[in-house]
Interface confidence: low
């Protein structure tokens, strides 16, 4: 499987809410011993591999934000910490993943990745991850709403084996 | 059968530090949460933190933030715990546990504990 | 922290008995919460998973209920086997925090 980044660059004004998305693609295992592992985390661009370096969302580890599931199961960050912090991690039966941000500040500017694990239990794993940056912004410059850019063909596929 | 060992028991002296080896077998070791839990004698259980080896970053109880330090080496499928400027109430049996489901906080398997005896 | 409070601290029970446990959490925890059996000398052994789910191997006679901040530990028939310390534990958000435990203790 793949994932997909549909937008690689998120250009949204102060205060703002944002919904970063992600696309798992290709034949996904439904089986019992099958779960994907889904969560969001800032990184910085490294000279050898986007997404290398795992931060935290608003001091919330990947480990808060994750989500579990078999197969295309729907699923969705419920925790109270996450929503204190005005993040919501959410997942369809589509294979679409996605985070919300509340109330953008310029803080929120960075590089954001998205992270899914395949694991065959006992077995194996797989992982997959894609990127992309969110810019924040104020004054007369900043757009009344946020404005997405498509990803080119060649980013909008991010694949990472383990 | 996955199986969790740790190493043996330690007999340290207050101010001092320990370090803890918990060697998995059996299954895929680095996309499932291992944390450690420690229990003093006669008391309940504590969690200290835990790490899921393939971010390599662990995430700590405030308690202990500062002190412990948890890494895991996936070449060799290990996880350690080190807690530095040891007490008397550090005294306890510490455990290692993964996570039954990658990064849920069930714990599944359990090593058979390492008693660390803080004394002068 | 999410703190868990078990109760009773302790039981006298005699074989054959129902034994009811119960734990409540400072904050909804929705179903995330696991009970785990400490004999001792032994590592603790997970029971039941996220509220109500046996865990492989577990006889039928454990069962769980609950959700949001009020759960149950449930053994229908208490076997000789079963005497031991009973922990929950939340798994909703990390601090991940026990109960103070139950000791289950032959009458």
């Known amino acids: 499987f793949k994932v997909a980044t549909p937008y690689s660059l998120y250009v949204c004004p102060e205060g703002q809410n944002v919904t970063l998305t992600c696309r798992l693609l290709g034949p996904v295992d439904k089986g019992h011993d099958v779960t994907f592992y889904k969560t969001w985390y800032r990184s910085s661009r490294g000279e050898v591999q986007t997404c290398s370096e795992r931060r935290p969302i608003r001091n919330l580890t990947f480990q808060d934000l994750h989500l579990h599931h078999g197969g295309h199961q729907a699923a969705n960050t419920s925790h109270d910490l996450a929503q204190r912090h005005g993040l919501e991690s959410a997942s369809d039966h589509h294979g679409n993943f996605s985070i919300t941000m509340r109330n953008l500040t310029l803080l929120d500017s960075g590089l954001y990745c998205c992270l899914v694990v395949e694991i065959r239990h006992h077995h194996s794993e797989h992982r997959v991850h894609g990127a992309m940056e969110l810019q924040v912004q104020t004054g007369k410059d900043a757009p009344s709403n946020c404005v997405v850019y498509p990803s080119s063909s060649q980013d909008s596929e991010n694949i990472t084996a383990a | 059968q996955v199986q969790l060992v740790q190493s043996g028991a330690e007999v340290k002296k207050p101010g001092s530090s320990v370090k803890v080896s918990c060697k998995a077998s059996?299954?895929?070791?680095?996309?499932?949460?291992i944390s450690w839990v420690r229990q003093a004698p006669g008391q309940g259980l504590e969690w200290m933190g835990g790490?899921?080896?393939?971010?390599?970053?662990?995430n700590y109880a405030q308690k202990f933030q500062g002190r412990v330090t948890i890494t895991a080496d996936e070449s060799t499928s290990t996880a350690y715990m080190e807690l530095s400027s040891l007490r008397s109430e550090d005294t306890a049996v510490y455990y290692c546990?993964?996570?039954?489901?990658?990064?849920?906080?069930?714990?599944?398997?359990w090593g058979q504990g390492t008693l660390v005896t803080v004394s002068s | 922290d999410i703190q868990m409070t078990q109760s009773p601290s302790s039981l006298s029970a005699s074989v054959g008995d129902r034994v009811t446990i119960t734990c409540r959490a400072s904050?909804?925890?929705?179903?995330?919460l696991n009970w785990y059996q400490q004999k001792p000398g032994k590592a603790p052994k997970l029971l039941i998973y996220?509220?109500?789910s046996l865990q492989s191997g577990v006889p039928s006679r454990f069962s769980g209920s609950g959700s949001g901040t009020d759960f149950t530990l449930t053994i229908s028939s208490l076997q000789p086997e079963d005497f031991a310390t009973y922990y929950c534990?939340?798994?909703?958000?990390?601090?991940?925090?026990f109960g103070q435990g139950t000791k289950v203790e032959i009458k």
């Open positions: 546990a993964r996570s039954s489901y990658g990064w849920s906080y069930e714990f599944d398997y």
């Open positions: 059996g299954g895929t070791f680095s996309s499932y949460a």
């Open positions: 790490i899921i080896p393939i971010f390599g970053t662990a």
């Open positions: 904050q909804s925890i929705s179903s995330y």
């Open positions: 996220a509220a109500s």
């Open positions: 534990q939340q798994s909703y958000s990390t601090p991940l925090t």
